[in-house]
Interface confidence: low
C-alpha cells in the first residue's frame, strides 16, 4: 500500500574538522521510494556538485573535504507524492585548529607614541590570543593590552618595551605560534649636559662640553656664530647610548657656540640644541680704560647707520679690533631680527654707535660714548616693549650671558649732553620733535607705547628714521 514518507533518523548536529569528511544521515521509510533533496542554508545542493557525495538513494550526504565556509544548517526533504513532503534539519559545526591569518611584523616606533602589533586569528572554537615577550608571557597593564582582535596595543611606548614578541593562538584543538618579531623603540635626541658659558681672557683655552642621548645615538655638531666651527679640536666618545663631545677652543674673539644633537628616525630627523657664549673679560670694560686708535669704519654691518667716512674707535685689547667689533655688532643684529619695525632701526643705530664709538683723534685717541638722552630715546620710545621683555627675561634668568653679546648700553651710566656737549655723541637719524613721533609707525596702536618725556628739541623738525632704513 502507498505510504507517505517518514524520516526515521532525524538529522543531528555534526562536528567536523577542516579537510575531514562529514556525513549527514536522513533515513526515510515510504512507499513508493521517495525523492530526497538536500539544502544548505535553504539553498539546494546540486547532485553533480563534486564536493559532495549523495548515496543510499539520497539518504546519506557526505561532504568530502570540509572547509570552514561549509558550516550552516543542512536539511533533507523527502517526497513521494503520497501525503506531504517531510523535512529534517541539522547543523554542521566546522571545528578548526587555530591559525594566525595576520601575523605581527617588525616595528620601529618613537618613544611616547602608540604601537600596535597585529595578530589576527581563525579557529573554532574561537582561539584565545596571548603574547610572549622574550621568553616570558606578557602581562597586560594600563599601557599594554591585548585587543579583541588579538592585536597587542602599547600606549606611550617606553624604552623598556623594546624586545622580541610573538603571539600565541590557542583553542581546544591546538595552539599556533607566530614568528618572533622585533619592537624597536627610538628616542628623540636630547641634550643631557649643555655647554657652559665662559668669560675668559684673550688667548686662553676653553673646553665646551656637550652630552646627548637618543636612540639611535645622536651625532653632535658644533656651530660658531651660525657657521660650522672652523677651528678648534673636537673629541667624541659614546657609551651606553650617550654621546659626549668636547670642543677645545683657543679664544681670540667672543662667540656664540651651539651644540646640535641630531638623530634619524626613518626619513625624519630630531634635533636638540644648546648654546653657550664665550666672552672676553676686557670686552665690557669702559672704553676709556682701553687703548685704541681712530680709523675710518670699513665694516659692512653698520654701513647704513654710521656717518660716511666716520672715524670710529678701534679697541686694541682685541687681537683684531675691526673683526672683533664687527662680530659683536653682527651677533647683536641677529638678535634684532625679532624686534618690531619701529624698534629695529633705532636699536641698530644705538648698537653700531655703541660698539663702534665715535673717535676723537689726538695724542691719546678717545672714544666718545653715546649721549644718555639718545640712549633713553631708543629705550623708552622706540623699543619700550622689547626693552621691558629683555629686562624681564634677564631678571627671570631666561638669558644667560648671551645678553652680554648684545652690548646694550646702560643708559644711566652714559654722559648727558648737558654736562659737556662734546663729551658724548648723538645718534644720526634720530631727533626729538615729540609731536611728530605720533606719525611714527606704531607697534600696536595709533599712540606711542609710552608717555613721551619732555626731551630737548633739536634743530631738526621731525622725529624720523632715515630713508636708509627699510620699514618693511
Amino acid at each position: 500500500l502507498p505510504k507517505a514518507p517518514v524520516i526515521t533518523t532525524p538529522l543531528e548536529t555534526v562536528d567536523a574538522l577542516v579537510e575531514e569528511v562529514a556525513t549527514f544521515m536522513c533515513a526515510v521509510e515510504s512507499y513508493p521510494q521517495p525523492e530526497i533533496s538536500w539544502t544548505r542554508n535553504k539553498i539546494l545542493i546540486k547532485l553533480f556538485d563534486t564536493r559532495y557525495s549523495i548515496r543510499e538513494n539520497g539518504q546519506l550526504l557526505t561532504i568530502l573535504s570540509v572547509e570552514d565556509s561549509d558550516d550552516g544548517i543542512y536539511c533533507c526533504t523527502a517526497n513521494n507524492g503520497v501525503g506531504g513532503a517531510v523535512e529534517s534539519c541539522g547543523a554542521l559545526q566546522v571545528k578548526m585548529k587555530p591559525k594566525i591569518t595576520r601575523p605581527p611584523i617588525n616595528v620601529k616606533i618613537i618613544e611616547g607614541l602608540k604601537a600596535v602589533l597585529p595578530c589576527t586569528t581563525m579557529g573554532n572554537p574561537k582561539p584565545s590570543v596571548s603574547w610572549i615577550k622574550g621568553d616570558s608571557p606578557l602581562r597586560e597593564n594600563s599601557r599594554i593590552a591585548v585587543l579583541e582582535s588579538g592585536s597587542l596595543r602599547i600606549h606611550n611606548v617606553q624604552k623598556e618595551d623594546a624586545g622580541q614578541y610573538r603571539c600565541v593562538a590557542k583553542n581546544s584543538l591546538g595552539t599556533a605560534y607566530s614568528k618572533v618579531v622585533k619592537l624597536e623603540v627610538e628616542v628623540f635626541a636630547r641634550i643631557l649636559r649643555a655647554p657652559e658659558s665662559h668669560n675668559v681672557t684673550f688667548g686662553s683655552f676653553v673646553t665646551l662640553h656637550c652630552t646627548a642621548t637618543g636612540i639611535p645615538v645622536p651625532t653632535i655638531t658644533w656651530i660658531e656664530n651660525g657657521n660650522a666651527v672652523s677651528s678648534g679640536s673636537i673629541q667624541e666618545s659614546v657609551k651606553d647610548r650617550v654621546i659626549d663631545s668636547r670642543l677645545q677652543l683657543f679664544i681670540t674673539k667672543p662667540g656664540l657656540y651651539t651644540c646640535i644633537a641630531t638623530n634619524k628616525h626613518g626619513e625624519k630627523f630630531s634635533t636638540a640644541k644648546a648654546a653657550a657664549t664665550i666672552s672676553i673679560a676686557e670686552w665690557s670694560k669702559p672704553q676709556k680704560d682701553n687703548k685704541g686708535y681712530c680709523a675710518q669704519y670699513r665694516g659692512e654691518v653698520c654701513n647704513a647707520v654710521l656717518a660716511k667716512d666716520a672715524l670710529v674707535f678701534l679697541n686694541t685689547s682685541y687681537a683684531d679690533p675691526e673683526e672683533a667689533q664687527e662680530l659683536l655688532v653682527h651677533t647683536a643684529w641677529n638678535e634684532l631680527k625679532v624686534v618690531s619695525p619701529v624698534c629695529r632701526p633705532a636699536a641698530e643705530a644705538l648698537l653700531c654707535n655703541h660698539i663702534f664709538q665715535e673717535c676723537s683723534p689726538g695724542v691719546v685717541p678717545t672714544p666718545i660714548p653715546i649721549c644718555r638722552e639718545y640712549c633713553l630715546a631708543v629705550k623708552e620710545l622706540f623699543c619700550a616693549k622689547e626693552w621691558l621683555v629683555m629686562e624681564e627675561k634677564t631678571h627671570r634668568g631666561l638669558y644667560r650671558s648671551e645678553m652680554h653679546l648684545l652690548s646694550v648700553p646702560e643708559c644711566s651710566k652714559l654722559p648727558s649732553m648737558h654736562w659737556d656737549p662734546t663729551a658724548c655723541a648723538r645718534l644720526p637719524h634720530l631727533d626729538y620733535n615729540k609731536e611728530n613721533l605720533k606719525t611714527f609707525p606704531p607697534m600696536t596702536s595709533s599712540k606711542p607705547s609710552v608717555d613721551i618725556p619732555n626731551l630737548p628739541s633739536s634743530s631738526s623738525s621731525s622725529f624720523s628714521v632715515s630713508p636708509t632704513y627699510s620699514m618693511t
Partner: antibody, heavy 124, light 107 residues
C-alpha cells in the same frame, strides 16, 4: 634610492599657465626642503623658489614673485610649481632639487639631489 | 640681493693641471656656500657644501675654501671627466644666488 622626477613642462603661449610636478621617492618631502632652479638655453643656473613643507615656509626669487607659487602635497610626496602669467624670459629647463632639513639648515647642506629637468617653452 | 661674482668665466687646462675657480660675494655672507659641476644636458651635481666640506662620493682632488667674502674651488689634478661647467651658490635664509658659471675646457 633618492630620486626626483619632474613633469608638466611643454610649450605655452605668453600669459599662459603651467604646473610643474616634482615626484620624490627614497625620502619624504616633509622632512626636507625642495627647491626649483631653472636654466635658460645656453645660460647659467637661476634659483626660482623653495619650500619647507614641515614648516610651511616658502621663498621666491624677485623675478617670479607674484606669478609663481611653490607647494607640496606630503601625502603624494610631490612638490609643485604653479607658473602663471608666463613670459618669454621664463623659457628654461626647470630642475627640482632637494636639501636636507628646514630653511635654516638647508643652505649649509647644499642641493644634494636633482631631477633630470623639464623644458618649459614660452612662445607665441 | 647678494651677488656671487664667479671668475674666470671659462678656462682651458690640461689633464693633471691644478685649477682654481673663485666666487666673490658682494657682501659678507655665511659659510652656506656650495659648488656644483654640470655637464651638457645633465642636472648639476653637488661637489662642496658649507664652503669647504666635500660631498660624499666626490673625489678628494676637489676642495673648497673661504677667505672673507672670497670662496674658492680647487681641482688639484684635473682629470678627463672633470671637463664641465662649475657653479658656486650662496644661501641666505633662502635668498639663494648662483655664480654665472665657469666652463673648464680641454686645452
Amino acid at each position: 634610492e633618492v630620486q626626483l622626477v619632474e613633469s608638466g613642462g611643454g610649450l605655452v603661449q605668453p600669459g599662459g599657465s603651467l604646473r610643474l610636478s616634482c615626484a620624490a621617492s627614497g625620502f619624504t618631502v616633509s622632512s626636507s626642503s625642495i627647491h626649483w632652479v631653472r636654466q635658460a638655453p645656453g645660460k647659467g643656473l637661476e634659483w626660482v623658489a623653495s619650500i619647507s613643507s614641515s614648516y610651511g615656509s616658502t621663498s621666491y626669487a624677485d623675478s617670479v614673485k607674484g606669478r609663481f607659487t611653490i607647494s607640496a602635497d606630503t601625502s603624494k610626496n610631490t612638490a609643485y610649481l604653479q607658473m602663471n602669467s608666463l613670459r618669454a624670459e621664463d623659457t628654461a629647463v626647470y630642475y627640482c632639487a632637494r636639501s636636507e632639513g628646514d630653511r635654516y639648515v638647508s643652505g649649509y647642506s647644499g642641493f644634494d639631489y636633482w631631477g633630470q629637468g623639464t623644458l618649459v617653452t614660452v612662445s607665441s | 640681493d647678494i651677488q656671487m661674482t664667479q671668475s674666470p668665466s671659462s678656462l682651458s687646462a690640461s689633464v693633471g693641471d691644478r685649477v682654481t675657480i673663485t666666487c666673490r660675494a658682494s657682501q659678507s655672507v655665511s659659510s652656506a656656500v656650495a659648488w656644483y659641476q654640470q655637464k651638457p644636458g645633465k642636472a648639476p651635481k653637488l661637489l662642496i657644501y658649507s664652503a669647504s666640506s666635500l660631498y660624499s662620493g666626490v673625489p678628494s682632488r676637489f676642495s673648497g675654501s673661504r677667505s672673507g667674502t672670497d670662496f674658492t674651488l680647487t681641482i688639484s689634478s684635473l682629470q678627463p671627466e672633470d671637463f664641465a661647467t662649475y657653479y658656486c651658490q650662496q644661501s641666505g635664509v633662502w635668498l639663494i644666488t648662483f655664480g654665472q658659471g665657469t666652463k673648464v675646457e680641454i686645452k
